[in-house]
């Protein structure tokens, strides 16, 4: 394989490395109160935390990025914590033809990795 | 749709926002000199730059993240610049049975977005 194995233990201490965290947001927070009817509050899972060398590397590119960041930190950024998968969520909203249901596949993160 | 349209013009000035940049790297830089034979130097396209509000948002989640970062910057990180797609690259490397060609699909970035 083109890379060392990504590591899963956080060298920075508990809760500091890339992980999933729940953020409460109202429709007002999101600017959606004029068109979304329900839910009125969302539990949004988001990816937060740092990406130390080889921690939860998304792929070969992320491993290279981590290595080159160590060599050229001003030129190559460290990998960052982004969703690896999503949980679909249904929203009820207003449309011109009435109340409509729509499933969003890319709204709530389900897992995170360093890319 | 669940979000405003992502914008493509960088409000921070030329070259400051999320974009693709070429980084030269040798096999030694990558720690691959003991097993990769060719190429001896790689032109690695990587994603660099900032992700200001709604710039090249990857999806609905990224748009929400940008909005909540504006409201709760200590709790929600800004979106960051990561690959949206990759260019496959062929490496020639040593194996127990001789020289082998292998295509890596996730090594060189082809496009970038803010996730």
């Amino acid at each position: 394989s083109a890379h060392a194995h990504p590591r899963d233990s956080c060298p920075l201490g508990p809760g500091r490395c890339c992980h999933l965290e729940t953020v409460q947001a109202t429709l007002e927070d999101l600017g959606w109160s004029d068109w979304v009817l329900s839910p009125r509050q969302l539990q949004l899972s988001m990816c937060v935390g740092e990406c130390p060398h080889l921690y939860r590397s998304a792929n070969t590119h992320a491993q290279i990025k981590a290595r080159l960041h160590g060599l050229q930190p001003d030129k190559v950024p460290a990998p960052c914590c982004v969703p690896s998968s999503y949980t679909p969520v249904v929203l009820m909203h207003r449309t011109d033809s009435g109340v409509s249901l729509q499933t969003y596949d890319d709204l709530v993160a389900r897992g995170c990795h360093c890319a | 749709s669940a979000h405003a349209h992502p914008r493509d013009s960088c409000p921070l000035g030329p070259g400051r926002c999320c974009h693709l940049e070429t980084v030269q790297a040798t096999l030694e830089d990558l720690g691959w000199s003991d097993w990769v034979l060719s190429p001896r130097q790689l032109q690695l396209s990587m994603c660099v730059g900032e992700c200001p509000h709604l710039y090249r948002s990857a999806n609905t989640h990224a748009q929400i993240k940008a909005r909540l970062h504006g409201l709760q910057p200590d709790k929600v990180p800004a979106p960051c610049c990561v690959p949206s797609s990759y260019t496959p690259v062929v490496l020639m490397h040593r194996t127990d049975s001789g020289v082998s060609l292998q295509t890596y699909d996730d090594l060189v970035a082809r496009g970038c977005h803010c996730a």
């Epitope: 009817l37 329900s38 839910p39 679909p88 969520v89 249904v90 009820m92 499933t103 709530v108 | -």
Partner: antibody
């Protein structure tokens, strides 16, 4: 296109257990916010909510019947089940299965008539 | 539990007439938690109005809903034959979820 179809025994005797199945398509019960409810309606009468199950397996029951009701789901096969124990003639009704996203009875099945008779 | 009282229980209206059905709630609820459903004989109920005033998809614009607190209403600006049905109000403010007894609207 969302569809829900209820199936049940049609007729059963007092004291037996009523088992109802709701088979649905056009949505997933693995989607956040999605739920499925059961509501019944005796002939010529009003609507009575029985139970509700959400995507995260949160279950809600009508307290007046709670001791007799069990709702469950098989999200992978798109089915929801309701069991009512110790039925009597007052349980004779049309039973509806309803797609219930967040806080609304959005799509209703055609209903299945259940008759409890000695 | 929250009790919903509809009135009238039965009414008849002529084509073109304005119709108002009321729903009184035993304790104050948020307007976003009061819904209406329409049922025609021998068919399943249909969602009609969500959150007091938002028409379900396909509901004619002659229908409207209003209210707050403990008092809600459904209004038809101009009765048409296809509007003859039973209308139920329902609350989603607290469990158990409850319905009004229904208002049967007939064509005169």
């Amino acid at each position: 296109q969302v569809t829900l179809k209820e199936s049940g025994p049609g007729i059963l005797q007092p004291s037996q257990t009523l088992s109802l199945t709701c088979s649905f398509s056009g949505f997933s019960l693995s989607t956040s916010g999605m739920g499925v409810s059961w509501i019944r309606q005796p002939s010529g009468k009003g609507l009575e909510w029985l139970a509700l199950i959400y995507w995260d397996d949160d279950k809600r029951y009508n307290p007046s019947l709670k001791s007799r009701l069990t709702i469950s789901k098989d999200a992978s096969s798109n089915q929801v089940f309701l069991k009512i124990t110790s039925v009597d003639t007052a349980d004779t009704a049309t039973y509806y299965c309803i797609q219930s996203p967040w806080d609304w009875f959005a799509y209703w099945g055609q209903g299945t008539l259940v008759t409890v008779s000695a | 539990e929250i009790v919903l009282t509809q009135s009238p229980a039965l009414m008849a209206a002529s084509p073109g007439e304005k119709v108002t059905i009321t729903c009184s709630v035993s304790s104050s609820i948020s307007s976003s938690n009061l819904h209406w459903y329409q049922q025609k004989s021998e068919t399943s109920p249909k969602p009609w109005i969500y959150g007091t005033s938002n028409l379900a998809s396909g509901v004619p614009v002659r229908f409207s809903g209003s209210g707050s607190g403990t008092s809600y209403s459904l209004t038809i600006s101009s009765m048409e034959a296809e509007d003859a049905a039973t209308y139920y109000c329902q609350q989603w403010s607290s469990y158990p979820l409850t319905f009004g007894a229904g208002t049967k609207l007939e064509l005169k």
